[in-house]
Amino acid sequence: RLSSKSVNAQVTDINSKGLELRKTVTTVETQNLEGLHHDGQFCHKPCPPGERKARDCTVNGDEPDCVPCQEGKEYTDKAHFSSKCRRCRLCDEGHGLEVEINCTRTQNTKCRCKPNFFCNSTVCEHCDPCTKCEHGIIKECTLTSNTKCKEEGSRSN
């Protein structure tokens, strides 16, 4: 399986959200910072963020070139040895989300709540619709908190 160890500060674990068609990593030597061992194949140089290996590294030391990830569909935000980029997140409108920042080759999509939706957790995977008040509003709905409604029969000063 893909190792959960990081090789060094610049080269991170590639077992990440949406990483496509990855080669299984069988061994990772944390002392060995020159490369990564893939099924008897050895990569010496990682690809920078936004790029991937054009193909898997070979046992004879042939080092594939790095090629760009597909803009708007894939990304890698760290240096890595994989021949595939990660899949960009979709901001699912069915979960009350919309795109805040589009996916680039080096950064995953950033989502936010759609208008009239809110989310009160730190990481928003789902936003809920703001409550509609029948008897008036105490506090408007924001991106991070629901509407506060007046109770029936309450007076406004």
Epitope: R1, L2, N15, S16, L19, R89, D92, V123, E125, H126
Partner: antibody, heavy 121, light 111 residues
Framework: QVQLVQSGAEVKKPGASVKVSCKAS????????MQWVKQAPGQGLEWMGE????????NYNQKFKGKATLTVDTSTSTAYMELSSLRSEDTAVYYC??????????????WGQGTLVTVSS | DIVLTQSPSSLSASVGDRVTITCKAS??????????MNWYQQKPGKAPKLLIY???NLESGVPSRFSGSGSGTDFTLTISSLQPEDFATYYC?????????FGQGTKVEIK
């Protein structure tokens, strides 16, 4: 309500091609990727590939590259899956399914009723 | 490819029984605390139906007797009290890595 309606069963000869349609309704077609899944008789489910209807970007399971071609017609909210050079092992029920994303976990929430493709000489 | 192995392949149970189906992945389908595992139900001649997404989230409209749990390589679908309409085949599916793969299915039959 959200619905995916697929075209009817097809019987084809080996070597022929077939195009299965999947008409979406009840949601914004271009907002959700469409997935395609194969189920051979008495067998399990096999993911074939996906298409983003907003720009026709496709991503295939390597096993189906060259076998399946995914397209969309946004004017009619219809997705298509064409199978070429048909062989007996392509005999299966083919499903389209709407893709959803929960923090990069992609899953299939609404499925078409399936289209049986039979390849027989 | 990630191989998903479901167990048992089939089981016989009675209405009211608690049923547990397991799905074991050949490598972890987790990242950053999230598990990329989904569960579907399929009845003969019908399309699959989503039950659980992201390991433990119940799909809207699915009865609360269905629940999902697990992380890493080991996942479980539980039906707390089996109902007549629950006799079907159940599939797990991972979306952490392409190609997305399904388990071979678990057939739940009437005892």
């Amino acid at each position: 309500q959200v619905q995916l309606v697929q075209s009817g069963a097809e019987v084809k000869k080996p070597g022929a091609s077939v195009k299965v349609s999947c008409k979406a309704s009840g949601y914004t077609f271009t907002s959700y990727w469409m997935q395609w899944v194969k189920q051979a008789p008495g067998q399990g489910l096999e993911w074939m590939g996906e298409i983003d209807p907003s720009d026709s970007y496709t991503n295939y399971n390597q096993k189906f590259k060259g076998k399946a071609t995914l397209t969309v017609d946004t004017s009619t909210s219809t997705a298509y899956m064409e199978l070429s050079s048909l062989r007996s092992e392509d005999t299966a029920v083919y499903y389209c399914a709407r893709n959803r994303d929960y923090s990069n976990n992609w899953y299939f929430d609404v499925w078409g009723q399936g289209t049986l493709v039979t390849v027989s000489s | 490819d990630i191989v998903l192995t479901q167990s048992p392949s089939s089981l016989s149970a009675s209405v009211g029984d608690r049923v547990t189906i397991t799905c074991k992945a050949s490598q972890s389908v987790d990242y950053d605390g999230d598990s990329y595992m989904n569960w579907y139900q399929q009845k003969p001649g019908k399309a699959p139906k989503l039950l659980i997404y992201a390991a433990s989230n119940l799909e809207s409209g699915v009865p609360s007797r269905f629940s999902g749990s697990g992380s890493g390589t080991d996942f479980t679908l539980t039906i707390s009290s089996l109902q007549p309409e629950d006799f079907a085949t159940y599939y797990c599916q991972q979306s952490n890595e392409d190609p997305r793969t399904f388990g071979q299915g678990t057939k739940v039959e009437i005892k």
